[in-house]
């Protein structure tokens, strides 16, 4: 499966959307950093047969749009920037699906390497439980936006990877 | 490789402007801030002040803020320190530095070679 | 502003000797430090981060611990190499600032 070079913009798109998207002066944020755990392993593409790696990806994106489709999320945003990185995101998770059916297909191998989908799954419940003992505070968020940036660049990077084994 | 390099070194005469720079290669310069420090001669180092290149926000230490102006060109992987009018007292070694910003990682962990700025009449 | 204060400002030690440098923030940081070696005509070079992490790269004798506002840098065994000036910075707000520095010279 061939990801559309609509996608890989589509990714850069929401990037830049998540990077306008800031509302406070993040300087007065520093003693709010928090170790979320990435799992930066589960994103470096090696180990991977390609229908595993789209998973993956596909659940990090899903995880991302969950987090931004909470009310607590549409009251920190500005609305009209969160609705255009939301569908960017239902964009690239109907492109990734198409390829999961795809892959699954060709390679015959289970839907999901289980490990790595609930090891993205456990990263998004440690975000979402800072962002409950911080009260969703606008600190808060800026940190969790800078952490999502970080780490959908790890996912754009994997999907790079990807392309060029095809 | 990640890579912070810096504008040579410069002889100023008091009351002069002066503007040095860094140029950042071998990452996303907008994913990281950029931070000054100086290093008088024979002395420790003091943070200057910080940018954010993706949106040229700025944080400075009291100590400098007034005295410096700290800006950067994200079309040209660069950040800058400027000085209107330099006095004596501005003769030190300048760094830049990559701060990872919000993210959970290493502080500062690449810094330019510095810039030796000498102020003399 | 914090207030970082190193102790001792220098030292004189052999190769092998175990090194122990303190700092104390004014005050608390939580984890907030990290720890630079400088030598001399060079830029500083981060050694450990977050109070504890071994930056890449660096030798596993230098290890850092502490939280709130004592912190240690520890060099396990001195080695020629290690011979210069450590700096511990807070980061936990702006102004982020240095202690004043501590030399480490050979005795």
């Known amino acids: 499966c061939d990801l559309p070079q609509t996608h890989s913009l589509g990714n850069r798109r929401a990037l830049i959307l998540l990077a306008q998207m800031g509302r406070i002066s993040h300087f007065s944020c520093l003693k709010d950093r928090h170790d979320f755990g990435f799992p930066e392993e589960e994103f470096d593409g090696h180990q991977f047969q390609k229908a595993q790696a789209i998973s993956v990806l596909h659940e990090m994106i899903q995880q991302t749009f969950n987090l931004f489709s909470t009310e607590d999320s549409s009251a920190a945003w500005e609305q009209s920037l969160l609705e255009k990185f939301s569908t960017e995101l239902y964009q690239q998770l109907n492109d990734l699906e198409a390829c999961v059916i795809q892959e699954v297909g060709v390679e015959e191998t289970p839907l999901m390497n289980e490990d790595s989908i609930l090891a993205v799954r456990k990263y998004f419940q440690r975000i979402t439980l800072y962002l409950t003992e911080k009260k969703y505070s606008p600190c808060a968020w800026e940190v969790v936006r800078a952490e999502i940036m970080r780490s959908l660049s790890f996912s754009t990077n994997l999907q790079k990877r990807l392309r060029r084994k095809d | 490789e990640v890579q912070l390099v810096q504008s040579g070194a410069e002889v100023k005469k008091p009351g002069e402007s002066l503007k040095i720079s860094c140029k950042g290669s071998?990452?996303?310069?907008?994913?990281?801030?950029i931070g000054w420090v100086r290093q008088m001669p024979g002395k420790g180092l003091e943070w200057m002040g910080i940018i954010d290149p993706s949106d040229s926000d700025t944080a400075y230490s009291p100590s400098f803020q007034g005295q410096v102006t700290i800006s950067a060109d994200k079309s040209i992987s660069t950040a800058y320190l400027q000085w209107s009018s330099l006095k004596a007292s501005d003769t030190a070694m300048y760094y830049c530095a990559r701060h990872p910003g919000l993210n959970w990682a290493p502080d500062f962990d690449y810094w330019g070679q510095g810039t030796l700025v000498t102020v003399s009449s | 502003d914090i207030q970082m204060t190193q102790s001792p400002s220098s030292l004189s030690a052999s190769v092998g000797d175990r090194v122990t440098i303190t700092c104390r923030a004014s005050q608390s940081i939580a984890e907030f430090l990290n720890w630079y070696q400088q030598k001399p005509g060079k830029a500083p070079k981060l050694l450990i981060y977050?109070?504890?992490s071994l930056q890449s790269g660096v030798p596993s004798r230098f290890s850092g611990s502490g939280s709130g506002t004592d912190f240690t840098l520890t060099i396990s065994s001195l080695q020629p190499e290690d011979f210069a000036t450590y700096y511990c910075q807070q980061s936990i707000d702006f102004p982020l600032t240095f202690g004043q520095g501590t030399k480490v010279e050979i005795k």
């Open positions: 977050f109070a504890s």
């Open positions: 071998g990452y996303s310069f907008t994913s990281y801030w």
